[in-house]
Interface confidence: medium
Amino acid sequence: LCQGSKYSTCASCPSCPDHWMKYGNHCYYFSVEKKDWISSLEFCLARDSHLLMITDKQEMSLLQDFLSEAFHWVGLRNNSGWRWEDGSPLNFSRIYSNSLVQTCGAINKNSLQASSCEVSLQWVCKKVSP
C-alpha cells in the first residue's frame, strides 16, 4: 500500500485522492470515524467508489496486514448467501457468522466477521485509481 512516504516516495505513487492509499490499480480509503453499514456504503458511493469488495486471498491478506483489531465494514451482505455488493459470491474465505440476524460483513486483521448492520464501525472504500 502506498501512502506518501510510508512505503515509497510520493513521486512513485500514481495519484489517489488525499487520504486514500494506492495498491495495484486501486485506491483505498480507511475511515477513522464510524458509521452503520448503509451509511458507510453511501459514503463510498458519494465518492465514486464502493464499499470494499475483495477480489482474492492476496488482496485480503495485504489489507489485513494494514488493519488493526478494529472491525471495518466491507461490501458484503447475506442475501440468501454471502455476496459482495456486485452480486458475486464470497468464495475465497469463510465469514464467521454467529446469528442469522447478523447480515452485514466486516473485516479486521484476523477475519471476516458477520455483524448486525446497524452497528457503527469504521469502513473501507475502494475505487479504480486514476
Epitope: D36, N98, V101, S116, E118, V119, S120
Partner: antibody, heavy 125, light 112 residues
Framework: QVTLKESGPGILQPSQTLSLTCSVS??????????VGWIRQPSGKGLEWLAH???????WYELALKSRLTISKDSSKNQVFLKIANVDTADTATYFC?????????????????WGPGTSVTVSS | DVLMTQTPLSLPVSLGAQASISCKSS???????????LEWYLQKPGQSPKILIY???NRFSGVPDRFSGSGSGTDFTLKISRVEAEDLGVYYC?????????FGAGTKLELK
C-alpha cells in the same frame, strides 16, 4: 449448534448469595457482537431481565437490582456467571440465560436468539 | 421504564382460526438509530422462550410464515393466520430500544 445450559443450587436460604452458571457451546463468548443475558421468571409470572455481559466484558444491570447483582464470564471455559447477594423469597424463580446480539448499543439489544432450558431456584427458610 | 401492555391476556382459539395479539408501549420504541427493536417470543409449557419475530416484522429462521408481525411507534401486533396445536403457549412482546429492556405480561393462547 448453539446451546446454553444454566446450573444453580436449587434451594438456598434468605440472606445467602445465589450463584448461577451458564455454560455455552457453539459460539465463543469473546467473539465480536456476542453477549449473554440473564432473565428470570417467577412461577406462573412474566419475564424480567436482570443483566447482560458483552464479548469485551462490558456489563449492564437492571437498575433496581444493581447493588445485589454481579455478572462475569470465563471465555476460556465458555461460562457466564451471575451472583445475587442477600436473596429473599421474592428471588424464587426460574433463571434463564440467553445469547444476545449486539446492534450498536451496549445498554440494550434486540435479539435473544438462543435460550437455555432454565434452572429453578427456591429461596426458603 | 417502558411499560409493554399486551391484550388480551388470554386468547381462546380454534385450530385453523386466525389469532391476533396486541402490544402497546408506554412511549415510542423507535431507537435513536431509526430502528424499532420490538420482538415476539413464544414460551410453550415447561420450556424456555423462543424468538419468533425481531425488529417488528422479521421472522426468525425456521419460524413458519403463518406468523407475522406489524406496527410502529407504540402499537404492535402479532398475527397467526391459521393456529396449529404447536402454537399454543404464552406469547411475550419485548422492547430492546430503551433501558431497561422490558417484556409484556404475556398472552396465553389456548384452545376454545
Amino acid at each position: 449448534q448453539v446451546t446454553l445450559k444454566e446450573s444453580g443450587p436449587g434451594i438456598l436460604q434468605p440472606s445467602q448469595t445465589l450463584s448461577l452458571t451458564c455454560s455455552v457451546s457453539g459460539f465463543s463468548l469473546s467473539t465480536f457482537g456476542m453477549g449473554v443475558g440473564w432473565i428470570r421468571q417467577p412461577s406462573g409470572k412474566g419475564l424480567e431481565w436482570l443483566a447482560h455481559i458483552w464479548w469485551d466484558d462490558d456489563k449492564w444491570y437492571e437498575l433496581a437490582l444493581k447493588s445485589r447483582l454481579t455478572i462475569s464470564k470465563d471465555s476460556s471455559k465458555n461460562q457466564v456467571f451471575l451472583k445475587i447477594a442477600n436473596v429473599d423469597t421474592a428471588d424464587t424463580a426460574t433463571y434463564f440465560c440467553a445469547r444476545v446480539i449486539y446492534y450498536g448499543s451496549r445498554s440494550a439489544y434486540y435479539s435473544m436468539d438462543y435460550w437455555g432450558p432454565g434452572t429453578s431456584v427456591t429461596v426458603s427458610s | 421504564d417502558v411499560l409493554m401492555t399486551q391484550t388480551p391476556l388470554s386468547l381462546p382459539v380454534s385450530l385453523g382460526a386466525q389469532a391476533s395479539i396486541s402490544c402497546k408501549s408506554s412511549q415510542s420504541i423507535v431507537h435513536s438509530n431509526g430502528h424499532t427493536y420490538l420482538e415476539w417470543y413464544l414460551q410453550k409449557p415447561g420450556q424456555s422462550p423462543k424468538i419468533l419475530i425481531y425488529k417488528v416484522s422479521n421472522r426468525f429462521s425456521g419460524v413458519p410464515d403463518r406468523f407475522s408481525g406489524s406496527g410502529s411507534g407504540t402499537d404492535f401486533t402479532l398475527k397467526i393466520s391459521r393456529v396449529e396445536a404447536e402454537d399454543l403457549g404464552v406469547y411475550y412482546c419485548f422492547q430492546g430500544s430503551h433501558v431497561p429492556v422490558t417484556f409484556g405480561a404475556g398472552t396465553k393462547l389456548e384452545l376454545k
